[in-house]
């Protein structure tokens, strides 16, 4: 089971409307781009055979790779959003670095393995939808870490 | 294909127990969180409990004490025993699928089973 | 915890007619709302999450919106397996997990 206490966030995080609605504005942006509809990233084959519990630490895996491997390559598109969306999620990204999970995690890396290699074969068009798809991962980090 | 069939369900004397059964086909309880929900006659859902994919289980505030859910991972079924029974339990008892999609999502639903609770 | 209010409680209405359902939420849900679609003595069926997303094999006629308390569900041209009981369902997370999952008190949908 994780250390539930590293694995939280504080509800605060995400009751700030300003960034809220420019990671919406971000996302939709994005999605506008996306002219792959029929892939979802984050969807029920992410958070299939994971726990409760396990689901923030999942979405630590995720988030980070959002950011690294999309995020700050693409930090020079889809402005103003990006300069203040990509800091605040680098933040959350920060607050959950003690988040780990004791025993056992091949499980959730193999379900965070599929979201990346799906992003990989799709090339930059995965890393515009993985930013189209920032809506869900901001919700998802929120009703998985709270 | 995935299915959803409750059992148990009947007339029962109030302050008595009864134990309802969800036999899942098509999907593994090891992968997927179950819920139990209810419908009173001629009236809405209502949240009873979940039970987790790693077997841990939450209630509604109403139902701590007097309903438990468990598994049978070897049976493919879930259960929800009722204990001191009211003639006010009297409903349509149904077992869910938890899909959690980022948020919690409930598909698709068993039949549902009906439990009278009367003297 | 948090109390979801659908209006109408009941509605007529024909063939052909829009229909819209609202769900007005005591607190921000955000977009954690649900839409199911319950047929007289038969289980609910998901139409809609994420406040605004399809459930898989639900037909475009119906489509769903809002965010944060107020929701909508929306019928674009009413069919006869339309006709229905129609409820919201939140889930809240972060709070006592006795009352992560709410519902509304439902819709009916009769033929006028």
């Known amino acids: 089971a994780p250390i539930s206490s590293h694995c939280r966030l504080d509800k605060s995080n995400f009751q700030q409307p300003y960034i809220t609605n420019r990671t919406f504005m971000l996302a939709k942006e994005a999605s506008l781009a996306d002219n792959n509809t029929d892939v979802r990233l984050i969807g029920e084959k992410l958070f299939h055979g994971v726990s409760m519990s396990e689901r923030c630490y999942l979405m630590k895996q995720v988030l980070n790779f959002t950011l690294e491997e999309v995020l700050f390559p693409q930090s020079d598109r889809f402005q103003p959003y990006m300069q203040e969306v990509v800091p605040f999620l680098a933040r959350l990204s920060n607050r959950l670095s003690t988040c780990h999970i004791e025993g056992d995690d091949l499980h959730i890396q193999r379900n965070v393995q599929k979201l990346k290699d799906t992003v990989k074969k799709l090339g930059e068009s995965g890393e515009i939808k993985a930013i189209g798809e920032l809506d869900l991962l901001f919700m998802s980090l929120r009703n998985a870490c709270i | 294909e995935v299915q959803l069939v409750e059992s148990g369900g009947g007339l029962v004397q109030p302050g008595g127990s009864l134990r309802l059964s969800c036999a899942v086909s098509?999907?593994?309880?090891?992968?997927?969180?179950m819920i139990w929900v209810r419908q009173a006659p001629g009236k809405g859902l209502e949240w009873i409990g979940i039970?987790?994919?790693?077997?841990?289980?939450y209630y509604a505030s109403w139902a701590k004490g007097r309903f438990t859910i468990s598994r049978d991972s070897s049976k493919n079924t879930v259960y929800l025993q009722m204990n001191s029974l009211r003639a006010e339990d009297t409903a349509v008892y149904y077992c869910?699928?938890?899909?959690?999609?980022?948020?919690?999502?409930?598909?698709?639903w068993g039949q549902g089973t009906l439990v009278t609770v009367s003297s | 915890a948090v109390v979801l209010t659908q209006s109408p409680s009941s509605l007529s209405a024909s063939v052909g007619d829009r229909v819209t359902i609202t769900c007005q939420a005591s607190?921000?849900?955000?977009?954690?709302l649900a839409w199911y679609q319950q047929k007289p003595g038969k289980a609910p069926k998901l139409l809609i999450y994420?406040?605004?997303t399809l459930a898989s094999g639900v037909p475009s006629r119906f489509s769903g919106s809002g965010s944060g308390t107020d929701f909508t569900l929306t019928i674009s041209s009413l069919q006869p397996e339309d006709f229905a009981t129609y409820y919201c369902?939140?889930?809240?997370?972060?709070?006592?997990?006795?009352?992560?999952?709410?519902f509304g008190g439902g819709t009916k949908v009769e033929i006028k």
């Open positions: 869910a699928r938890d899909r959690f999609v980022g948020v919690d999502i409930f598909d698709p």
């Open positions: 098509g999907f593994s309880l090891s992968s997927y969180a």
């Open positions: 039970i987790d994919i790693d077997g841990s289980t």
């Open positions: 607190e921000d849900i955000y977009t954690n």
């Open positions: 994420w406040a605004s």
């Open positions: 369902q939140a889930s809240v997370y972060g709070n006592s997990a006795d009352s992560r999952y709410t």
